[in-house]
Each structure stands twice: as C-alpha cells, then as structure tokens.
C-alpha cells in the first residue's frame, strides 16, 4: 500500500481542502472511525487500484486517525493497512468529543491504560488532573492517543490552554473491577412452605463486580415470570445478591430453582440449584418408631430420643402420667428439643439417676396449628435383683427347709443348687440343681408378689429337703434382665451338733 502524502502525521489548516491518495495491487479503501467516508475508487491500466479521499472545509473535528486498507483481503495479508494521523488545529474545538463508553474505563487487573483526551493542535500543552485536584499528574501525554499509565480508581480530567482560555475535558472514570472465577451460593429463607406463604431465594456471588443473573423456576416454565431484585451487600465487598421473591406460593411452585450467573469479562459461569417444596398444609412426621415399652435401670441415667420432621416449627411438650414435665431444678429431668435441620428436630428426655417413682406413662406431644403427634410409651424401671434373706429351719416334721427371699424388676427367676462335697465344690465339681419335680429328696414352693408402690417383684421360694445325711452347701441364685445375686447356706444333718 502506498499513501500520499506519506505522513504518518499531518498538520492541516482549518477550512482548507486536502486530498489523500492510497494505491495498491488490489482494491483499496479509506476508513475513518470504522466507517468508509465518500471517496473515489479507480483502477489504472497497469492494474493498480487507487482510492482518493478529498477532505473539504476542514475543522478541528476532522482531527484523528485515517486508515487505508485493502477492500477485499482474501488471499492478502489481513493486517496490511496504513495509518495516517491528521491534526487540524482549531481554536473553537477544545478536546475532541468522546463516545460515552470512552469516559468509563474498566480494568480487571493492574495494567496500563489510556485516558483518551485529545486536542486538535499538537503544539498545545495538555495536563492531567484528578477531578477535584489542581496538581498536574506526572503521566506522559501522546497527542494522538492521550495519557497512558497505571491509574487508581478515581475520576480524572485533562486541561489545556487555547489562547488565553483554559479548557477542561469531560471527566474520565477509572474502575478497577474485581473479577475472579465465579462462586455462586443459593439459599432460601425456607425450603418448605405452605401454600399461600412466600418463597424467597437468594443467589449470592462473591469476588465479582459485574455479573448477570438468570433464574429458572417452575413458574417460569408456565410463562409466569417473576422479576428478581439485585443488590450489593455494602458491608461485604464484592458480594452481589439476586433475590427471587414469589408471594403466595402455590403447590405448582414446588420444584427446582436454579440461579445461573455469568461474568462477561472472562466469560465465566456457574449455577446452583435448590429444591423448594410447597405443602398443602403443615405436617408432623416421625422418623423411626419408639417402642411402646421402654426400660431404664435404677440409679442410672437414661435418655429417650424422638426424631421427627415438622413444618411449621412445632411446640414440643413432654408429659408423665398426663402431667406436664419441665426441666427440674434438682437436675433429675432434662428436656431439650434441637432443630438439627430446617424441618428436622430431635427431642430428648433425660432422666438423671433414675428413681423408681419415675416409672410410668410418658407422652411427647409435638404440635402446631395444622397437625400434631402424640408419642406414648410406658417406662419400666429395671431394678437389679437382691437376695434379701436366705435362712434354714428344722420343722418338727423332720425335714429341713431353706427359705430364699429376693426382689427385682423385671421378675427374677430363682435357681436352687446344692453341693455335697464342701471341699471340692463349687470350684471342681459343679453344684447340683435342686427343685426338679423328679427328685424326691427335695421339694420347691415359690410365690411371686408385685409391689405396686415400689414397682418391683418379690420372690419367696422355700426348698424342702427330705433327709440330709451330711453337710450340704445350698445356694439360692436370683437372676433377671439386669443382674443376678447369690447367697449360700450350709445345711447340716439333725444329728450334728453344730451349724456353720
């Protein structure tokens, strides 16, 4: 490409006319501000193409870049073009006008930028200032481009003097944008709502300043659009939030709500979804069954736990034998209901060092205005067995009797056993079980009584021994679900003068 005059910089007089010519081996065209001004194109006999641009009645606004480029770049070097910069000093034009977007300069990293304030006269002295400051900033100036350097997030103006008149440019605003990989979080005020209540969702992006939110939701699919609201969380820098609010939810609003966020600077994107359930009315549901008979061991602590789901949040009460329970000041009973997730609860009744009196009928009631559950169970206090008495007697009938009395809850079983060889028993020889009906030498009689007040069973068992011819170790063992207890007595024949 050949341009005449060759430039690269020309200074022309205002109101004059000037002709620019460009020629090349293929069709050529002049461009000014990305447009093709009126020009004359021709093809010479030698096959050379040319274009003539005539600039008439020049003004300062004709100041700027002019390019000559190939009209059809097929098969040619696409980047071949010639640049010419023309100044038309014009005292009536201060700074050349900018498009609105040129006044706002956005940065995503610390980098050199240009504040594009340009004048029509290359001889003018131009200075750069902060908008509210008089001090000229030490930034190099190029009359064809403007001030280039690294700038802070501020507002700037350029100044020059034309004759005796000081001229200010428009203000330029530099913004350093925070741009990072997008991290979206979506949450809802409630993920479960009753019909008629509101659905409110929030989509928050951290680390970016300019993003675009797009929501998809069940209502949108049926053509009913909801306008989200976007705001900036002032107390948290670079937090942008989009709020989707659906008043008076319907059952059809149940489903997946997705927030899609795009950031156009680096073309990043992320999306998160959340499920919303709209229920016709509130509910209570149990997660797991509690047996209708529960056990606790005397003097031990016992926690009874109920896990349930409810919406709206319920009131939880515990009762014993139809009387309301509360945390006891003595620390014998502790009640707690924890909200372990939005709609899930764990309610616990803890009995500290269980007493017999704490046996009874317990009910947990969880309720709200729509629904309830009453969970009931009987609490049985298990008491380890104790042998309270083991005694031997010699009735006149000649037989010998051994009486064993013990208590416990649940009902104890009684086991009688005897050992005839005192030296070797019970270590070497196992004791013989007594009381089997087949054995004629012993008879057994057992009575069981339930003591309502103490809530435990008493077992009284009498062993009748028909003839004892040598010392005999008789053992009474009581056993129930929570333990066993044993006592032993030596029974001697009538004829022997001593008893152990």
């Amino acid at each position: 490409l050949v341009v005449t005059p060759p430039g690269p910089e020309l200074v022309l007089n205002v109101s004059s006319t000037f002709v620019l010519t460009c020629s090349g081996s293929a069709p050529v065209v002049w461009e000014r501000m990305s447009q093709e001004p009126p020009q004359e194109m021709a093809k010479a006999q030698d096959g050379t193409f040319s274009s003539v641009l005539t600039l008439t009645n020049l003004t300062g606004l004709d100041t700027g870049e002019y390019f000559c480029t190939h009209n059809d770049s097929r098969g040619l070097e696409t980047d071949e073009r010639k640049r010419l910069y023309i100044f038309v000093p014009d005292p009536t034009v201060g700074f050349l006008p900018n498009d609105a977007e040129e006044l706002f300069i956005f940065l995503t990293e610390i980098t050199e930028i240009t504040i594009p304030c340009r004048v029509t006269d290359p001889q003018l002295v131009v200075t750069l200032h902060e908008k509210k400051g008089d001090v000229a900033l030490p930034v190099p100036y190029d009359h064809q481009r403007g001030f280039s350097g690294i700038f802070e997030d501020r507002s700037y103006i350029c100044k020059t003097t034309i004759g005796d008149r000081e001229v200010d440019s428009d203000a330029y605003y530099v913004y350093r944008l925070q741009v990072s990989s997008i991290n979206v979080s979506v949450n809802a005020v409630q993920t479960v709502v009753r019909q008629g209540e509101n659905i409110t969702l929030m989509c928050i992006v951290i680390g970016n300043e300019v993003v675009n939110f797009e929501w998809t939701y069940p209502r949108k699919e049926s053509g009913r659009l909801v306008e989200p609201v976007t705001d900036f969380l002032l107390d948290m820098p670079y937090h942008i939030r989009s709020i989707l609010h659906i008043p008076s939810a319907e059952l059809e609003d149940s489903g997946t709500y997705t927030c899609n966020v795009t950031e156009s600077v680096n073309d990043h994107q992320d999306e998160k979804a959340i499920n919303i359930t709209v229920v016709e009315s509130g509910y209570v549901r149990l997660l797991g069954e509690v047996g209708t008979l529960q056990f606790a061991e005397l003097h031990r602590s016992r926690t009874l736990q109920v896990v349930f789901e409810a919406y709206p949040p319920p009131t939880v009460l515990w009762f014993k034998d139809n009387r309301t329970l509360g945390d006891s000041s003595a620390g014998e009973i502790a009640l707690s209901t924890r909200n372990v997730s939005e709609t899930r609860y764990v309610s616990e009744l803890t009995l500290v060092r269980v007493k017999v009196a704490e046996a009874g009928h317990y009910t947990m009631r969880a309720f709200h205005e729509d629904a309830e559950v009453q969970l009931s169970f009987q609490l049985q206090i298990n008491v380890p067995v104790r042998v309270l008495e083991l005694s031997e007697s010699h009735p006149d009938s000649g037989e010998q009797t051994v009486r064993c009395r013990g208590r416990g809850m649940p009902q104890p079983n009684i086991i009688w056993s005897a050992c005839r060889d005192l030296k070797r028993c019970p270590r070497e020889l196992p004791p013989t079980l007594l009381g089997n009906s087949s054995e004629e030498e012993s008879q057994l009689e057992t009575n069981v009584t339930y003591w309502e007040e103490e809530q435990e069973f008493e077992v009284v068992s009498t062993l009748r021994l028909q003839h004892v011819d040598r010392p005999l170790s008789v053992r009474c063992t009581l056993r129930n679900a929570v333990g066993q207890d044993t006592q032993e007595v030596i029974v001697v024949p009538h004829s022997l003068p001593f008893k152990v």
């Epitope: 229920v279 016709e280 509130g282 509910y283 209570v284 549901r285 149990l286 997660l287 797991g288 069954e289 509690v290 047996g291 209708t292 729509d370 629904a371 309830e372 559950v373 009453q374 969970l375 009931s376 169970f377």
Partner: nanobody
Framework: EVQLVESGGGLVEAGGSLRLSCTAS????????MGWFRQAPGKEREFAAA????????GYKESVKGRFTISRDNAKNTVYLQMNSLKPEDTAVYYC?????????????????WGQGTQVTVSS
C-alpha cells in the same frame, strides 16, 4: 400392593357417633403408618388423624381433637376412627391411607396407598 377398604360411613345427626373401619390386604399391615383424611364438598383433602405402626403415636387435626379417636388392631389388619360429638362441618368423604415412608405422618403426600373413601354426612 396394599388395598384399603373403608366402611362405617353414613348419615348421622349432629352430636351422634360413627365408627369408621379400614381393612388392609396385600401387605404386612404392621409396617405401615395409617391415616384418615377427609374431603368436604368443594374443599381440598385434609388430614384428620394418624397412627404410627405400633400404635404408640397418634395425632389429630385440632378441630377434631377430643372428639375423634384413632386406633389400630394389627392382628386384624384394621385401623379405626371413632367419631363422637359429630358436627355438620365434619361432613365429608373420609379416606383411609397407608404410608410405607414414615412411621407416622400427617402429610398427605407421604401416603402411598389410598382407599376409595366412605361418605359421612352429619345433619343439623
């Protein structure tokens, strides 16, 4: 698959009583939470009462509490709703429902199996 058949509905004067029964077949009854729901003319179906698998947990809609009693007999595969002091606003079709999902629930959507319903009409 569980089939549920309700019975015991009918016409009764205000203040009277009815006992609804629901018999299940085709499944292990004791593994289902059972519920009674009702639907009055022109209204949505609503929870009335529910009972857990072992009968240890029960619950009622506030407006029927103290008047209705739910119970079950796992040996007979039957759940009952004893309705006393009936009011005209209790008029509805009463549906029996079974839930495998939870041991007890008042939420209609938790119930997998439904009966055809039995009409209860309370005249004033």
């Amino acid at each position: 698959e569980v089939q549920l058949v309700e019975s015991g509905g009918g016409l009764v004067e205000a203040g009277g009583s009815l006992r609804l029964s629901c018999t299940a077949s085709g499944g292990t009854f004791s593994t289902y939470a059972m519920g009674w729901f009702r639907q009055a003319p022109g209204k949505e179906r609503e929870f009335a009462a529910a009972i857990s698998r072992n009968g240890g947990s029960k619950g009622y809609k506030e407006s029927v509490k103290g008047r209705f009693t739910i119970s079950r007999d796992n040996a007979k595969n039957t759940v009952y709703l004893q309705m006393n002091s009936l009011k005209p606003e209790d008029t509805a079709v009463y549906y029996c429902a079974a839930s495998r999902t939870y041991t007890y629930s008042t939420a209609m959507k938790d119930y997998n199996y439904w009966g055809q319903g039995t009409q209860v009409t309370v005249s004033s």
